[in-house]
Interface confidence: low
Amino acid sequence: MPLSLGAEMWGPEAWLLLLLLLASFTGRCPAGELETSDVVTVVLGQDAKLPCFYRGDSGEQVGQVAWARVDAGEGAQELALLHSKYGLHVSPAYEGRVEQPPPPRNPLDGSVLLRNAVQADEGEYECRVSTFPAGSFQARLRLRVLVPPLPSLNPGPALEEGQGLTLAASCTAEGSPAPSVTWDTEVKGTTSSRSFKHSRSAAVTSEFHLVPSRSMNGQPLTCVVSHPGLLQDQRITHILHVSFLAEASVRGLEDQNLWHIGREGAMLKCLSEGQPPPSYNWTRLDGPLPSGVRVDGDTLGFPPLTTEHSGIYVCHVSNEFSSRDSQVTVDVLDPQEDSGKQVDLVSASVVVVGVIAALLFCLLVVVVVLMSRYHRRKAQQMTQKYEEELTLTRENSIRRLHSHHTDPRSQPEESVGLRAEGHPDSLKDNSSCSVMSEEPEGRSYSTLTTVREIETQTELLSPGSGRAEEEEDQDEGIKQAMNHFVQENGTLRAKPTGNGIYINGRGHLV
């Protein structure tokens, strides 16, 4: 509102009086002073308080306060007039935007509120105070309107493992004054920034470059924008995604022995990792997949195994970035054919040792049997010779025995026992290969000491046949036999050095 309007409202007398007063005080030391701010800072959209307070002596009064915008190079533009009597008048350009501070109000306070500050409001403002009786005062302040930035984050091109230094994201923020743009991340990378100045603001763009690797997947990359118009930093977070595809491998064949005919629940699992998450495809290299085989993503499930499930299976892993293959050979075992294979080393060793031991044992038996037969034949030959040699003395011997009333039934028990124990027929043995040691008592008789020994030895080695041979060699045998005996009173007595005497195959003793 122009000041002239204020003058008309005051009336000529008052105005004249005021001019006289002002004139009288102009150039003199003022009675008071204006309190204001050099700079008023307000955020876009907020209300700006333009301070102007007259601090004077008691009794002084403020007649009116005029506010005008006084940007350099432009004429003054009236904002409002605050009159002590007629109140606030706002110029049409600021209608509805300029107000007095809320009550209680001090009559010396000429401050006003500029509602909803916009960037165009930024500039210099002048406060002119007319007082009574001290005269007029003026002060200037600068209004600064902060335009907080609205940052935007733009991801770079798709990141792929194996690329070189690549743009991960760029962050742009425009504001007044120029904002600060930085990055907050644990990812290693490089940044570069550039600014663009506009008439009332500035735009800042910062780029973040990195060398993509799969370890960056899921890592946040945060653009941090600082600005005096922000109570706290603005942060926009972008989650990094790096395309990759790991090598494929197949699990499930760790124990080949489990892959046998009839096994249920057998499965192969394809292992890989990728971004984007890969898809899986199963094929069989040597033909189509057998019937009943279920494909469930990365898993190949088998029905009860048969030999037709043997073959080479291929897992094909792929995503938009790459593809990988892994193949395995499945060999379904037949437990009947391969039962021998399933005997463990210890069992096999035991069997081998047992077989060898059995062979050695039987070899030993064969040797013993052969030697036994050899000695038996030799003994039979000796028996025949001795019987032939004693043929001539039998009758005398029998007669001698009868004269001594000797009867085989009256022999002591131990004699009979010896005979029973010594007889080959009584040697029973459950083992398949038995060993008989006949040498000690049945072969070499150095000295004949007792009748009982003679009886036992006779029974052991007396043959059941061979009578024909006896008759033929009778004469020669008698001569030889007589070398072993001494004739004494019609009887024969064994010489002390003679070998065993064999008489009478029926067991009668001398």
């Epitope: 935007s152 984050l153 899921g218 890592q219 977070t237 989650i239 995604h241 998450p277």
Partner: antibody, heavy 122, light 106 residues
């Protein structure tokens, strides 16, 4: 202020399909990831799935994988959950959630809708 | 899977901690639910970020593979079930929540 309004819940039949829509306002919808989280009666929170800010990536929880599809329309500021082959265990309150960044993790949800109740019963 | 204690309790004014551990979780969020069926409220996201309308007594941290929600000077109105949430960046499908921890203010 950020508001998220879910709609589309109610009584559903087993084997059928369900379509829930969430409309966001009070924020730059195209800058944030969105997620769906559900809670069965008397149980804890369960991640259903989510979509990134651009709508180019989606992720789903194990219980609904293969049955759920999440899409978004940044022009309309809406995100949609389509769940097929409904089962009794899908019963619960479904919440729409906004994340603080452009992804859909359960680690950075900063705003929740009031939820819409879904009952799957014959 | 995310593991968190089923319940914790504290007297008013005390400090209480709720932990959440996962295999390969880089970041954790914490969500408060005062009654079943009521919408959860985010108290912490991205390990340690607090929404502007959440009191400063709520704070979050992460050490190793364990995330921790700390309430310093717990108040009666903090009594609720607290769920942790995490994102498994290795699979890109695995967003998950813990089973929930019931906080009782004695």
């Amino acid at each position: 202020t950020v508001t998220l309004d879910e709609s589309g819940g109610g009584l559903q039949t087993p084997g059928g399909g369900l379509s829930l829509v969430c409309k966001g306002s009070g924020f730059t919808f195209s800058s944030n990831g969105m997620a769906w989280v559900r809670q069965a009666p008397g149980k804890g929170l369960e991640f259903v799935g989510g979509v990134n800010a651009a709508g180019s990536w989606t992720g789903y929880g194990a219980a609904v994988k293969g049955r759920a599809t999440i899409s978004r329309d940044n022009g309309q500021s809406t995100v949609r959950l389509q769940l097929n082959d409904l089962r009794a265990e899908d019963t619960g309150t479904y919440y729409c959630a906004k994340t603080a960044d452009d992804w859909y993790g359960a680690d950075d949800i900063d705003a929740w809708g009031h939820g819409t109740e879904v009952i799957v019963s014959s | 899977a995310l593991t968190q204690p089923s319940s914790v309790s504290a007297n008013p004014g005390e400090t209480v901690e709720v932990t959440c551990s996962g295999d390969d979780s880089r970041y954790y969020g914490w969500y408060q639910q005062k009654s079943p069926g009521s919408a959860p409220v985010t108290v912490i996201y991205y390990n340690d970020k607090r929404p502007s309308d959440i009191p400063s007594r709520f704070s979050g941290s992460k050490s190793g593979s364990t995330g921790t929600l700390t309430i310093t000077g717990v108040q009666a109105e903090d009594e609720a079930v607290y769920f942790c949430g995490a994102y498994d960046s290795t699979t890109h499908s695995g967003s998950a929540f813990g089973a929930g921890t019931t906080l009782t203010v004695l």
